[in-house]
């Protein structure tokens, strides 16, 4: 009995579901009573799913299993696999058993996108050049292991002292933190690019350099130049930085933390006292750093309903504010691809592709092309629908007459995480069914 | 029109120098490094370094390092390579080419039209 | 050093066919460019960070690739396309180019 599989990985996002195909070819006459499926771990044998006696007899795997019952008799032998995680990263075994008996094996590759880049410098106050200074890239909760590479405003690699190092979390998600020694010229701008291997998505941020004195008089509040961007579920810091002068004592400090347009209290430090959180309780200071100035603010559990600018006070004896702003994101998943008409397509018919990614933020970027690579534009119709946590399910549809052949992309790009995601379909030009029976 | 103009060629005797010079126009010069890569007949392209024209950094390909050297003149928008002990092995087209982009992706997007410096006895 | 090798070093092809080059690289690279050149001029920008079209280049150009793996295509080969193309990286000193693919007329 031949029991067919994809050859390549099945690749899989972090938390959507993933369908491991397998398919065999019934005789005529065949009835389910007659079949024995079994998925099972290739390497430990472990039961994942089963049917046998004209019954499914369910998911022993975590209950994160199902098969196709409805195509069963056509012999689609499929198992979703629903929430992957990490842990499920591997090979699957497809067992058929009908009055023959017939085996194959499929991967299954996870995936999870790394976050933009965040880039901090130590010291970051009254540089000069000459000094040497510290730059730390750090990247969030990514799978697999991600590959980093630094260079300057010039796009001259920077290989020399950058140290990476990358932590896997209790999800299995990697956080990567590369740090890069310099010594600054006259001004620099500085370049790192995190790279998944698996879902060829880079996601880089850079930094400028301008050593020169801070001025005088008021007190000097520092943010960063450019948005944090945070991905939803995670926790985000929205970093500010004063400087102390000799002899400060927290009793001097009054710290505000305000959304800049709606000036509703977030959180507050005086009197000594961390005042706490006024903002859901999501809130939190960074205590035991007050005293060197670092008056960065953590926000636990990023929502959609967080982005915006959220404003830094500083009163010592002088004062001074800065505004640093919130951009939220969340990656969109691999677009599924749905035709319709799905059976007995020929030349010269008109087809619906419908390509649907889900629970993204912020808004996607659609684009469609054929197997040359040359843009699809017309006829094509992209909506995009916010949940109530404020995520976007994207559905766009590509109307077309179909040729002999042809292979139909789909590209879903998040602005923001610079993240691409793409599905596609190729349809042949023999009278066809899709999705293709084996 | 962004150009890049390479000076003519050259015969030159073996332990001998040549200065090679390329003349940028019709973009800000010390914004964009200038390379240089030659081509021996009937081979591929090999990377001999890189200037800055702003900070006046410069790169080499270990191969070159000790025979050449690259400089640039902002008053001019002059880049120029100098390769010196040259044998024969060194006969080949000399480009300069100006490496563009933004971060985090880069290209050679403009080259010299090639000078060729033959070594001969 | 990061070492390019380009597949096949040498092709045959016919107008029309479709035509794939690659370019291993010894370690893991950032992103790779293409370039074409024809004989007795100057290299020419076809693609750069792996998948992108330089300006002018005809769509029949693609790239693709990730790592230590990257693919150059001609989906449909035009006369004017018979040339020897180079992969090239910076991702790391020295800045090195695959020893080329010549592309000739079969």
């Known amino acids: 009995l031949e029991v067919q599989v994809p050859e390549d990985p099945v690749v899989a996002l972090v938390g959507t579901d993933a369908t491991l195909c397998c398919s065999f070819s019934p005789e005529p006459g065949f009835s389910l009573a007659q079949l024995n499926l079994i998925w099972q771990l290739t390497d430990t044998k472990q039961l994942v799913h089963s049917f046998a006696e004209g019954q499914d007899q369910g998911s022993a795997y975590a209950n994160r299993t199902a098969l196709f019952p409805d195509l069963l008799a056509q012999g689609n032998a499929s198992l979703r696999l629903q929430r992957v995680r990490v842990a499920d990263e591997g090979s699957f075994t497809c067992f058929v058993s009908i009055r023959d008996f017939g085996s194959a094996a499929v991967s299954l590759q996870v995936a999870a996108p790394y976050s933009k880049p965040s880039m901090t410098l130590e010291p970051n106050k009254d540089l000069r050049p000459g000094d040497t200074v510290t730059i730390t890239c750090s990247s969030y909760q990514g799978y697999p292991e991600a590959e980093v590479f630094w260079q300057d405003g010039q796009g001259v690699p920077l290989t020399g002292n950058v140290t990476t190092s990358q932590m896997a979390n209790e999800q299995g998600l990697f956080d990567v933190h590369s740090i890069l020694r310099v010594v600054l010229g006259a001004n620099g701008t500085y370049s790192c690019l995190v790279r998944n291997p698996v879902l060829q998505q880079d996601a880089h941020s850079s930094v400028t350099i301008t050593p020169q004195r801070s001025p005088t008089g008021a007190v000097e509040v520092q943010v960063p130049e450019d948005p944090v961007v945070a991905l939803v579920g995670t926790d985000a810091t929205l970093r500010c930085s004063f400087s102390p002068e000799p002899g400060f004592s927290l009793a001097q400090l009054n710290l505000i933390w305000q959304l800049t347009d709606t000036k509703q209290l977030v959180h507050s430090f005086t009197e000594g006292r961390d005042q706490g959180s006024a903002y859901a309780n999501r809130t939190a200071l960074f205590p035991d750093l007050l005293a060197q100035g670092n008056a960065s603010l953590r926000l636990q559990r990023v929502r959609v309903a967080d982005e915006g600018s959220f404003t830094c006070f500083v009163s010592i004896r002088d004062f001074g504010s800065a505004a640093v702003s919130l951009q939220v994101a969340a990656p969109y998943s691999k677009p599924s691809m749905t035709l319709e008409p799905n059976k007995d397509l020929r030349p010269g018919d008109t087809v619906t592709i419908t390509c649907s990614s889900y629970r993204g933020y912020p808004e996607a970027e659609v684009f469609w092309q054929d197997g040359q690579g040359v843009p699809l534009t017309g006829n094509v119709t992209t909506s995009q629908m916010a949940n109530e946590q404020g995520l976007f399910d994207v559905h766009s549809v590509l109307r077309v007459v179909l040729g002999a052949n042809g292979t139909y992309s789909c590209l879903v790009r998040n602005p923001v995480l610079q993240q691409d995601a793409h599905g596609s379909v190729t349809i042949t030009g023999q009278p066809m069914t899709f999705p293709p029976e084996a | 029109e962004v150009q890049l103009v390479q000076s003519g060629a050259e015969v030159k005797k073996p332990g001998s120098s040549v200065k090679v010079s390329c003349k940028a126009s019709g973009y800000s010069f010390t914004s964009y490094t200038i390379h240089w890569v030659r081509q021996a007949p009937g081979q591929g392209l090999e990377w001999m370094g890189y200037i800055n024209p702003n900070s006046r950094n410069t790169d080499y390909n270990q191969k070159f390092k000790d025979r050449v050297t690259i400089t640039a003149d902002k008053s001019t928008s002059t880049a120029y390579m100098e390769l010196s002990s040259l044998r024969s092995e060194d006969t080949a087209v000399y480009y300069c080419?100006?490496?563009?982009?933004?971060?985090?992706?880069?290209?050679?997007?403009?080259w010299g039209q090639g000078t060729t410096v033959t070594v001969s006895s | 050093d990061i070492q390019l090798t380009q597949s096949p070093s040498f092709l045959s092809a016919s107008v029309g066919d479709r035509v794939t080059i690659t370019c291993r690289a010894s370690s893991s690279v950032s992103y790779m460019n293409w370039y074409q050149q024809k004989p007795g001029k100057a290299p020419k920008l076809l693609i750069y960070a792996t998948s992108n079209l330089a300006s002018g280049v005809p769509s029949r150009f693609s790239g693709s690739g990730s790592g230590t793996e990257f693919t150059l295509t001609i989906s449909s080969l035009q006369p004017e396309d018979f040339a020897t193309y180079y992969c090239q990286q910076w991702s790391s000193n020295p800045l090195t180019f695959g020893q080329g693919t010549k592309l000739e007329i079969k």
């Open positions: 080419a100006r490496y563009s982009g933004s971060t985090p992706y880069w290209y050679f997007d403009v």
